[in-house]
């Protein structure tokens, strides 16, 4: 064998350890990535792992906070199943008193009679809370209301169906003051103003009456 | 002083619609009832229609319910009728008129406003 | 449609005294108050009494109004040739819900 073929030999093997070098490499290279990939998705899941655990550990103390408090609102029934509700059917509850807005359209005295016969009063407002109230609770509607405020002419005070006299600083009623008629000077409101006229004509009413807050 | 001046009067055939203005003034516009009244060629006084101070009460004549419209504008100081289907028993002078009350006296009238309805 | 009735015409010498009727029903003169009017010749309406009795600043005391059950009357005293116009009457029916007016009565100063 001449050296030149020796030299040839080598050469070639060389190549081939090289070829199989780079290959070994490519294979730890990948395995390595591989490694790390499985790493990296490892971490991954254990965070998710963790962040689930907390979730749940969250939710498992809102429900145990839900059903205290369910606790809490049946023992609140079972109290309030004793009691009778603070006002009737239909009618609206707002502080003291229950209100009910009328769905017929009456002079005063015939509005007078109707809250009457419900075991109330028309309309009386003893606060700028009331007024408010009220205001707000026909903001809706254009129409008037009879309040239980009256007088027979206008060198009479304004008096409410009690006998009490209006509170000046309430509000000041508008409107027909400076008239006297056979039937009376009544007091409407609507849109939030109060307004003087012949309590003959028909409108709607507000009559009110007292909640009941006690237990029985 | 207090004064009431109508426009929008003038001649519309039948079924045909005009819309009357009443300008106020020298007064709180909104502490009154306002009214039409108007008048035949010749004849007497006929009340039209009312409105309360903020509109809550109105009331027609049965002559115009259904055809007239009543209102008012507080920022303008304005009363209006809206007049429509009109027909030849409708010529009149109308007056618009102020009230301390929906159900008293007039106690301010205007001069009126000619409305002829004629083919 | 005239709820409140009126005498169509009346008539008085200078000097003398005349009254013109309104006669109306339960439902207006009998539960609200009457007002007079009177206009003039080609002029609107001016009102002469209100609150069945009450005459408003600047209107002669000579005019003078009342009211009884379901009728009411204005008198005229001292008859002025001025005084010669149409006076209405007017009031609320409650029933009907609206003002009525007197079909109007024309007063001549002979």
């Known amino acids: 064998m001449q050296l030149s073929q020796v030299s040839d030999l080598l050469t070639q093997e060389q190549a081939n350890l090289t070829h199989q070098k780079k290959k070994l490499e490519g294979q730890i290279s990948a395995r390595q990535q591989a490694e790390e990939a499985s790493q990296e998705s490892e971490n991954e899941l254990k965070e998710m792992i963790e962040t689930l655990a907390r979730k749940l550990n969250e939710k498992s103390k809102e429900q145990m906070e839900l059903h205290h408090q369910n606790l809490n609102l049946q023992e609140t029934l079972k109290r309030v199943a004793n009691c009778s509700a603070p006002c009737p059917q239909d009618w609206i509850w707002h502080g003291e008193n229950c209100y009910l807005f009328s769905s017929g359209s009456f002079n005063w005295e015939k509005s007078q009679e109707k809250c009457l016969s419900l075991d109330a009063k028309l309309l009386k407002i003893n606060s700028t809370a009331d007024l408010d109230f009220i205001q707000q609770a026909i903001s809706y509607s254009s129409f008037p209301f009879w309040m239980g405020l009256s007088r027979r002419n206008p060198s009479y005070p304004w008096l409410w169906e009690d006998g009490s006299p209006l509170m000046p600083h309430l509000f000041r009623v508008r409107g027909a003051v400076s008239q006297t008629y056979p039937s009376g000077t009544c007091a409407y409101i609507q849109r939030g103003a109060v307004y003087a006229e012949n309590c003959i004509l028909a409108a709607f009413s507000i009559c009110q009456k007292k909640a009941n807050l006690r237990a029985q | 002083q207090v004064q009431l001046l109508e426009s929008g009067g003038g001649l519309v055939q039948p079924g045909g619609s005009l819309r009357l203005s009443c300008a106020a003034s020298?007064?709180?516009?909104?502490?009154?009832?306002l009214h039409w009244v108007r008048q035949a060629p010749g004849k007497g006084l006929e009340w039209v229609s009312v409105?309360?101070?903020?509109?809550?009460?109105?009331y027609y004549a049965d002559s115009v319910k259904g055809r007239f419209t009543i209102s008012r504008d507080n920022s303008k100081n304005t009363l209006y009728l809206q007049m429509n289907s009109l027909r030849a028993e409708d010529t009149a002078v109308y007056y618009c008129a102020r009230s301390p009350g929906l159900t008293s006296y007039h106690d301010s009238w205007g001069q009126g406003t000619l409305v002829t309805v004629s083919s | 449609d005239i709820v409140l009735t009126q005498p169509p015409s009346v008539s008085g010498a200078p000097g003398q005294r005349v009254t013109i009727s309104c006669s109306g029903s339960s439902s207006n003169i009998g539960s609200n108050y009457v007002s007079w009017y009177q206009q003039l010749p080609g002029t609107a309406p001016k009102l002469l009494i209100h609150s069945n009795s009450h005459r408003p600043s600047g209107v002669p005391d000579r005019f003078s109004g009342s009211k009884s059950g379901t009728s009411a009357s204005l008198a005229i005293t001292g008859l002025q040739a001025e005084d010669e116009a149409d006076y209405y009457c007017q009031s609320w029916d409650y029933e009907s819900e609206r003002v009525v007016f007197g079909g109007g009565t024309k007063l001549t100063v002979l």
């Open positions: 020298g007064f709180t516009f909104s502490d009154y009832a």
């Open positions: 409105i309360s101070y903020q509109g809550g009460f109105i």
